[in-house]
C-alpha cells in the first residue's frame, strides 16, 4: 500500500492511526477507507491532542523522516470549484467523512485564495521542536498531490475509525501477553481502550511453551452502550504470584485465599461487574463523568445522571462537557461585542464611548469639546470622528491634519498674486512696487510714478495688516521676499525684472515699511477667477476668499 501503520491511539469512541509514507491525499484516504475509516478529523482541541499523541508515537518509532517540517494528511478538503470562504472557520473546507462544520480551526497562515484546484489540508509538524500539548500541529493547505507526487514535505497521514463503543483492556493476573487485533487490522498489545469487535488473544505463561495457555476473547456489546469481553475473573492467574502480580489483574481490591487463589473486590460505593474484575460506582456521579466545569446531577433513584453547566455555558454534543455560549450571536451590543468565557462585553468603536439609552449603547465622543480639541484652529465634530479646518490664509498641515500652516500666497500654485513685489504675512499677503513705480488703487498693479530712485514701496505697518488684498490682473513683475527663520518676511525682497520696459534699477536696499499708496480695503473682480489648488473650490481671487491652496473643507482628523 505504500504506508505502514506505526501507531494507534484509542480514546472515547474512536481510534486514530498514524502512518508514514509519501502518498497523495487521495491515496491516503483510500488507505484509511479500505479499513473502514477516513482521514482523521480534528474538530476540537481535545481531538487535536489525540491526533498529536498518535503522531508522537509514530515519530518515536520512525527512524528518519526526510523533512524537518513534515506534513501528515488529515481529512479536511475543498473540492474543485468550491471557493475559499473567509467568513467560515473551515474557510469553505469540509471533512471527508461528512459531519457538520465545527468552530475549531488551527490554520498555519493565511490561505491561498483559489477555487479551481482541489485543496487538501495536512498537519504541519516541526520535527526540530518537541510535541507539546500546548503547541498543537498547525493546519497547512495545499495541492492534494497525485500518485508518485504527493506534494512537498508530505511524510504520512492520520486515519480515524469510529466505533459504537470500547472495551476496557484485559487485565492479567499473572505472566502473559495480550495481543489485540482491531477491526481496522491493527495489532497492538497496549491500548487504553479497545474498540468494539476487536479480538484479544491472551497467551499465559512466561514463555515456556509447555506452560503456555491461550485464551481468545471478542469485545461485544453486552447491553446498550455496555461493552465487555465476556470473560470472568482475572486471566493468567498463578498461585505463585497471587495478588502480587499486577494486583491480580483486579481493578480495585485483590483478596488472596490461603491456597494461593484470590478474588477481586471493590471499595465502598462501588460494585463488582460481571467480569469479576472491574468495579463500577454505585453512584454514577462518583466517577466524575462531567467535564469542563459541568456539575453532575443524580437522576431519580440514583440510577443515572445529567450534567449541568454554569451560567454562560452550555452542554456540548457529548452532553458531558460545557462549552462557552457565544452571547454575541444575539447581537446584544450597539457596536462591538466581545465574547468572553461565560459571558460577553460590549465595546465601542473608535470615536465613540459607552453611554446613551439601553444596555451596551455607545455615544459619539465630541472631540471638539472645550479643552479637548485636537485642532490648532477650527474643529468640527462628526459622528464617530471630527475634522479640522483653518482660518483664511492658512492650510491644514501635520501628519494627522490637525495643524494649520500659513499659506505663502506669494508662491501660490497660480503664480505670484502681485504685479511686482509680494510680501507674505501670517494669514495674508501684501503687494509692493519697485522704485519708480507706485501701487495702483487695486492694491496689486504697479503704475509708473514720479521718477524716484528711492526704495521700493513695501509692506504696510502693523496696524494696516488686515484682509488679503489683490485681484488677478495681467502681471508685470513678481517678487517674493525670502523667508525668515520663523516664516516671517525678511527685510530684503527677491525681485524679478519687470516685463514692462523700464530703466528703473532693481534694488536690494533695505525696505522702508510703507503702506501701499491708496490701497483699497477689499477688491473683488468676480468675472476673473484665480486657479486654486486641484479639487479646491473655485473662488474669486483677492478679498477674503481663499486665493491659493486653501480648501476650508478640512481633512478628517485621525483618531
Amino acid at each position: 500500500t505504500g504506508a505502514d501503520t506505526e501507531a494507534v491511539v484509542c480514546v472515547g469512541t474512536a481510534c486514530y492511526t498514524a502512518h508514514s509514507g509519501k502518498l497523495s491525499a487521495a491515496e491516503a484516504q483510500n488507505h484509511c477507507n479500505q479499513n473502514g475509516g477516513n482521514l482523521a478529523t480534528v474538530k476540537s482541541k481535545e481531538e487535536a491532542q489525540h491526533v498529536q499523541r498518535v503522531l508522537a508515537q509514530l515519530l518515536r518509532r520512525e527512524a528518519a523522516l526526510t523533512a524537518r517540517m513534515s506534513k501528515f494528511w488529515i481529512g479536511l478538503q475543498r473540492e474543485k470549484g468550491k471557493c475559499l470562504d473567509p467568513s467560515l472557520p473551515l474557510k469553505g473546507f469540509s471533512w471527508v467523512g461528512g459531519g457538520e462544520d465545527t468552530p475549531y480551526s488551527n490554520w498555519h497562515k493565511e490561505l491561498r485564495n483559489s477555487c479551481i484546484s482541489k485543496r487538501c489540508v495536512s498537519l504541519l509538524l516541526d520535527l526540530s521542536q518537541p510535541l507539546l500539548p500546548s503547541r498543537l500541529p498547525k493546519w497547512s493547505e495545499g495541492p492534494c498531490g497525485s500518485p508518485g507526487s504527493p506534494g512537498s514535505n508530505i511524510e504520512g497521514f492520520v486515519c480515524k475509525f469510529s466505533f459504537k463503543g470500547m472495551c476496557r483492556p484485559l487485565a492479567l493476573g499473572g505472566p502473559g501477553q495480550v495481543t489485540y487485533t482491531t477491526p481496522f487490522q491493527t495489532t497492538s498489545s497496549s491500548l487504553e481502550a479497545v474498540p468494539f469487535a476487536s479480538a484479544a488473544n491472551v497467551a499465559c505463561g512466561e514463555g515456556d511453551k509447555d506452560e503456555t495457555q491461550s485464551h481468545y476473547f471478542l469485545c461485544k456489546e453486552k447491553a446498550p452502550d455496555v461493552f465487555d469481553w465476556g470473560s470472568s475473573g482475572p486471566l493468567c492467574v498463578s498461585p505463585k504470584y497471587g495478588c502480587n502480580f499486577n494486583n491480580g489483574g483486579c481493578h480495585q481490591d485483590c483478596f488472596e485465599g490461603g491456597d494461593g487463589s484470590f478474588l477481586c473486590g471493590c471499595r465502598p460505593g462501588f460494585r463488582l461487574l460481571d467480569d469479576l474484575v472491574t468495579c463500577a460506582s454505585r453512584n454514577p456521579c462518583s466517577s466524575s463523568p462531567c467535564r469542563g466545569g459541568a456539575t453532575c446531577v443524580l437522576g431519580p433513584h440514583g440510577k443515572n445522571y445529567t450534567c449541568r453547566c454554569p451560567q454562560g455555558y452550555q452542554l456540548d454534543s457529548s452532553q458531558l462537557d460545557c462549552v462557552d455560549v457565544d452571547e454575541c450571536q444575539d447581537s446584544p451590543c450597539a457596536q462591538e461585542c466581545v465574547n468572553t468565557p461565560g459571558g460577553f462585553r460590549c465595546e465601542c468603536w473608535v470615536g465613540y464611548e459607552p453611554g446613551g439609552p439601553g444596555e451596551g449603547a455607545c455615544q459619539d465622543v465630541d472631540e471638539c469639546a472645550l479643552g479637548r480639541s485636537p485642532c490648532a484652529q477650527g474643529c468640527t465634530n462628526t459622528d464617530g470622528s471630527f475634522h479640522c479646518s483653518c482660518e483664511e490664509g492658512y492650510v491644514l498641515a501635520g501628519e494627522d491634519g490637525t495643524q494649520c500652516q500659513d499659506v505663502d500666497e506669494c508662491v501660490g500654485p497660480g503664480g505670484p498674486l502681485c504685479d511686482s513685489l509680494c510680501f507674505n504675512t501670517q494669514g495674508s499677503f501684501h503687494c509692493g512696487c519697485l522704485p519708480g513705480w507706485v501701487l495702483a488703487p487695486n492694491g496689486v498693479s504697479c503704475t509708473m510714478g514720479p521718477v524716484s530712485l528711492g526704495p521700493p514701496s513695501g509692506p504696510p505697518d502693523e496696524e494696516d495688516k488686515g484682509e488679503k488684498e489683490g485681484s488677478t490682473v495681467p502681471r508685470a513683475a513678481t517678487a517674493s521676499p525670502t523667508r525668515g527663520p520663523e516664516g516671517t518676511p525678511k527685510a530684503t525682497p527677491t525681485t524679478s525684472r519687470p516685463s514692462l520696459s523700464s530703466d528703473a534699477p532693481i534694488t536690494s536696499a533695505p525696505l522702508k515699511m510703507l503702506a501701499p499708496s491708496g490701497s483699497p480695503g477689499v477688491w473683488r473682480e468676480p468675472s476673473i477667477h484665480h486657479a486654486t489648488a486641484a479639487s479646491g473650490p473655485q473662488e474669486p481671487a483677492g478679498g477674503d476668499s481663499s486665493v491659493a491652496t486653501q480648501n476650508n473643507d478640512g481633512t478628517d482628523g485621525q483618531k
Epitope: 471557493c83 475559499l84 491561498r112 483559489s114 477555487c115 479551481i116 484546484s117
Partner: antibody, heavy 120, light 108 residues
C-alpha cells in the same frame, strides 16, 4: 500594482486556431487564478474558463470544451488561452482577468483585451 | 447553468436622477457570489460592486447594491455624467460563471 498585459489583435481564418497570451506583473503569478472572458455584441460577456497557475489545473465552460486549452509558463508569469476550430461567431474581444485578493470570483483585475477577428 | 437576466436593457435617465438596475437569476445565488461591473465604450469591464453590496475600491458612495436569492439590484442615488455606461451582473454557484446581458445607462 497588479497589471495584466495581453498580446495584440489577431486576424484568423475560419477553422484555424488562435493563442492569446496574458503577462502578469505586480504580484506572485502562482498566487492568483487566471480566467478568460470574451465579449461579443450578440452573446455579451462569456466566461471561457480559468487556470490555477500553481497546479496547472483548469476549469472550462462546457460551451467551449474540446476547443479551448489553457496553459501557463510560471517562469515568465504568463498565461495562455488557445481556441481552435474558429468560426465567425468567435469574433470577439478576449480578456484575461483575475480576482486578486478579493473572494467569491469578483474579478478585480482585467487585461486590456485582445480583438480576435475570424474572417476568410 | 444559471442564466442572469438584466432589465431594462437600456435606461434613459437625466443627471441628478435616481437609477435602479435589476438582475434576476434563473435559480438562487449566494449573495457573496453576486457582483456588478461597469464598462465604458472601448474599455475593459471594471469591478464596481462585489458580494451584492460592497463597493469596490474608489467607487463613489452614490452607488449601492442589494438583494438575495434570485433578485439583485444596483442603485445610483443621483446620476453624475461619469456614471453613464453599461453595467453587468455576474454570479458564481458552480461552473460556469455567468454574466447578465447588461444594462446601458444613457443620458435622457
Amino acid at each position: 500594482q497588479v497589471q495584466l498585459v495581453q498580446s495584440g489583435a489577431e486576424m484568423v481564418k475560419p477553422g484555424a486556431s488562435v493563442k492569446i497570451s496574458c503577462k502578469a506583473s505586480g504580484y506572485t503569478f502562482t498566487d492568483y487564478e487566471m480566467h478568460w472572458v470574451r465579449q461579443t455584441p450578440v452573446y455579451g460577456l462569456e466566461w471561457i474558463g480559468g487556470i490555477d497557475p500553481e497546479t496547472g489545473d483548469t476549469a472550462y465552460n462546457q460551451n467551449f470544451k474540446g476547443r479551448v486549452t489553457m496553459t501557463r509558463d510560471t517562469s515568465i508569469s504568463t498565461a495562455y488561452m488557445e481556441l481552435s476550430r474558429l468560426t465567425s461567431d468567435d469574433t470577439a474581444v478576449y480578456y484575461c482577468t483575475n480576482y486578486g485578493n478579493l473572494y467569491y470570483y469578483a474579478m478585480d483585475y482585467w487585461g486590456q483585451g485582445t480583438l480576435v477577428t475570424v474572417s476568410s | 447553468e444559471i442564466v442572469m437576466t438584466q432589465s431594462p436593457a437600456t435606461l434613459s435617465v437625466s443627471p441628478g436622477e435616481r437609477a435602479t438596475l435589476s438582475c434576476r437569476a434563473s435559480s438562487s445565488v449566494s449573495s457573496s457570489y453576486l457582483h456588478w461591473y461597469q464598462q465604458k465604450s472601448g474599455a475593459s469591464p471594471r469591478l464596481w460592486i462585489y458580494s451584492t453590496s460592497n463597493l469596490a475600491f474608489g467607487i463613489p458612495a452614490r452607488f449601492s447594491g442589494s438583494g438575495s436569492g434570485t433578485e439583485y439590484t444596483l442603485t445610483i442615488s443621483s446620476l453624475q455624467s461619469e456614471d453613464f455606461a453599461a453595467y453587468y451582473c455576474q454570479q458564481y454557484s458552480g461552473y460556469p460563471l455567468t454574466f447578465g446581458g447588461g444594462t446601458k445607462v444613457e443620458i435622457k
